[in-house]
Amino acid sequence: AVDLTLLANLRLTDPQRFFLTCVSGEAGAGRGSDAWGPPLLLEKDDRIVRTPPGPPLRLARNGSHQVTLRGFSKPSDLVGVFSCVGGAGARRTRVIYVHNSPGAHLLPDKVTHTVNKGDTAVLSARVHKEKQTDVIWKSNGSYFYTLDWHEAQDGRFLLQLPNVQPPSSGIYSATYLEASPLGSAFFRLIVRGCGAGRWGPGCTKECPGCLHGGVCHDHDGECVCPPGFTGTRCEQACREGRFGQSCQEQCPGISGCRGLTFCLPDPYGCSCGSGWRGSQCQEACAPGHFGADCRLQCQCQNGGTCDRFSGCVCPSGWHGVHCEKSDRIPQILNMASELEFNLETMPRINCAAAGNPFPVRGSIELRKPDGTVLLSTKAIVEPEKTTAEFEVPRLVLADSGFWECRVSTSGGQDSRRFKVNVKVPPVPLAAPRLLTKQSRQLVVSPLVSFSGDGPISTVRLHYRPQDSTMDWSTIVVDPSENVTLMNLRPKTGYSVRVQLSRPGEGGEGAWGPPTLMTTDCPEPLLQPWLEGWHVEGTDRLRVSWSLPLVPGPLVGDGFLLRLWDGTRGQERRENVSSPQARTALLTGLTPGTHYQLDVQLYHCTLLGPASPPAHVLLPPSGPPAPRHLHAQALSDSEIQLTWKHPEALPGPISKYVVEVQVAGGAGDPLWIDVDRPEETSTIIRGLNASTRYLFRMRASIQGLGDWSNTVEESTLGNGLQAEGPVQESRAAEEGLDQ
């Protein structure tokens, strides 16, 4: 069972001093921040017992395994159901405490009732303040039964529940009709899932015989020991004032566990601490009684004395619960109450015994849960004891349960049961997760869900290049930390698997499923520099760059050009996808803008060093295009162009630019300036005969404007090849006059 205790401090004279504390003895309890331990939760449960709303209660965490609830302002704040939840995963457990008002009309004779399936449970509500009205019993807040007020027997109202079943479990209350719910007697009924002394699915397994008021858990067969007792069968008493599964916790305050109610996981419920009794756990046990709620009787023999915390204290020469066993009778010594082994291991188990006559090897045997008897393979005989060593065959899951070491001599016999837990080594259910990658390293999260049993003691990460037959590399890591696999090959796929281990021999689980993780490319190291750039228009920029010469192949997939517009806070990125490219045309830029320009080599997703930046000012946008451009051949070497001025000019035109290109030619176009902006006609001279030309033009004010439409015209035939076109302008009217 989960080591979880809910302590209620019952100093009821002052509700402000009342507190509830939930203490977990579980490893990693309450940390909450990691995957291995969810936090402890402690709260008032208002689903069944609803009380008037008050100020919110204060929750204080004391370290990782304790949480305390305070801030009760009036007695009614205390009445009701409180619960603490702790433990992880399938072991998550709720412990419940039910608080009754000491001033209620009806008070429970006993708050917690733990019964077996099929038993008859009897809840008894004692009359504290009589009313002459019906008594209504409720179960989990819903009507259950009515008693006439005359039906009180001996000042008590009894609710008999025959043949109870697990669904009958819950919170029961007895209330006088018309009385406040706060005046009710509240009970907790816990119905074990099995009949007396049985546990497990189908209730086929036998309980270990829990001592000192311990209760056998119907799911796992473990004894839930009363506060102040420990051991597989609760056979050992803790020192006064101690509690917890290993007696590791100490009651707060100078009066030890006085005034504290202890609630433990079902099916135990709640009781006073060992040595105390009464509704407020403030009364010491009467002589001859001991244990939680003083429910146990000592009945010491052979001069033993009764200690209210631990039971019989035997004089020299005697032992046993009632000091009924002579030390001449053989006795099993110091047997651990619980052992844990991993599946498929072959452990050695030792069992030591003493007595008179002295036990020998053959007189000590080990019995498994299925009844198989193992004989010891060797024995170590010492003056005061004989230790028998047993070699256990390969363990299977069915070996989990209660084993027994038994010693028999002519002086009598003794046996000691102990719990063996066969644990399944953990196996990852998922592959590890890739967090980040570089060219030579991978950062991996090894923490995955797993089947089998924790705790996880070590995590091994196995990795090797994909499709490789070479040995796996292995790294052992802390379970809660990310792992960096280093010194890997760039641009390489690696198969990565997790292996988890739990403590103990044979605790290594099978490897988890593989996953493919690929390292990044090598980083490009070459730094380009910008050779030059020129503006090809108000929104176009041609850029060229170079790379240093180095031996070997170029490490790179292409270039990234970056233009930063500082005014607008905008970045433009242009990808040039050939590593051989050394020039690029950037279009769609914003005219009149000051850009910072740089270039970087890239490889896969990695960028190399950027070139030193250049600063480029694009001219502002120019005027609209000239209209109605027309071309007319004049001779075998001359073509006249005519046009109309652009409309809606933002200012005076400074010049026109004519672009001349041989139709279908592969050469660069020729640009000719018309420096007299008032003209609307020009003659292009020096053309080749019988050649088809393309013409377009644009105006310039502060910057070049938009291109006009393109026109085609051919020179007349059979002239000699000219040296190249030139231009002569005049006003259109003048040309017409001629």
Epitope: T133, D134, Y143, L177, E178
Partner: antibody, heavy 117, light 110 residues
Framework: EVQLLESGGGLVQPGGSLRLSCAAS????????MTWVRQAPGKGLEWVSS????????YYADSVKGRFTISRDNSKNTLYLQMNSLRAEDTAMYYC??????????WGQGTLVTVSS | QSELTQPASVSGSPGQSITISCTGT?????????VSWYQQHPGKAPKLMIY???KRPSGVSNRFSGSKSGNTASLTISGLQAEDEADYYC??????????FGTGTKVTVL
């Protein structure tokens, strides 16, 4: 669904006897206090008798004490009202009702008893 | 076991609030907070509207509320609706495990 169904009513002469039954379904009958309430034609409701779950405690209105007997059979989920020495003033619609908390939360549709010569 | 006294009739317009009184003695209404109220439509069985003085069963409109002062209990219907037209009866615990009903009030929605 919680249901109560009365039966056994009818015409009876003064001084005669009648036994009413109330069949319960849809709930754990043996856990509830049960009551008979009657309503004379055109008149108000009148509490007649109550019986506790165990059957050991029974109570009657003064007007019927000594003549009527309430009983129950928890194994048959049935409530009874044995009416002897009937009088004309016992003529009424007889309802059985289930009591939970402080009220009669579930009622049958009633059975009519007419005492007349 | 004398009956509790209720007004024979109470009327109100839709949307109005009305209050029905139920007067008993110090032996019944005055001693216990165990008054319940029932609504009965013609030809139908009664229906529990309020119990233990002021508690409403689930499914009953919050327009119905109960209160008590001294020997008199009251049922208030707010936001009167046509379907509220019915007979209403109070009932009180009278001690010694006996109960007593009221004379009944006819509620008319004008």
């Amino acid at each position: 669904e919680v249901q109560l169904l009365e039966s056994g009513g009818g015409l009876v002469q003064p001084g005669g006897s009648l036994r009413l039954s109330c069949a319960a379904s849809g709930f754990t009958f043996s856990n509830y206090k049960m009551t008979w309430v009657r309503q004379a034609p055109g008149k108000g409701l009148e509490w007649v008798s109550s019986i506790y779950p165990s059957g050991g405690w029974t109570y009657y209105a003064d007007s019927v004490k000594g003549r009527f007997t309430i009983s129950r059979d928890n194994s048959k989920n049935t409530l009874y009202l044995q009416m002897n020495s009937l009088r004309a003033e016992d003529t009424a619609m007889y309802y059985c009702a289930r009591q939970e908390d402080g009220g009669y939360g579930t009622w049958g549709q009633g059975t009519l008893v007419t005492v007349s010569s | 076991q004398s009956e509790l006294t209720q007004p024979a009739s109470v009327s109100g317009s839709p949307g109005q609030s009305i209050t029905i009184s139920c007067t008993g003695t110090s032996s019944d209404v005055g001693s216990y907070n165990l008054v319940s109220w029932y609504q009965q439509h013609p030809g139908k069985a009664p229906k529990l509207m309020i119990y233990e003085g002021s508690k409403r069963p689930s499914g009953v409109s919050n327009r119905f509320s109960g209160s008590k002062s001294g020997n008199t209990a009251s049922l208030t219907i707010s936001g009167l609706q046509a379907e509220d037209e019915a007979d209403y009866y109070c009932c009180s615990y009278a001690g010694s495990s006996t109960y007593v009903f009221g004379t009944g009030t006819k509620v008319t929605v004008l």
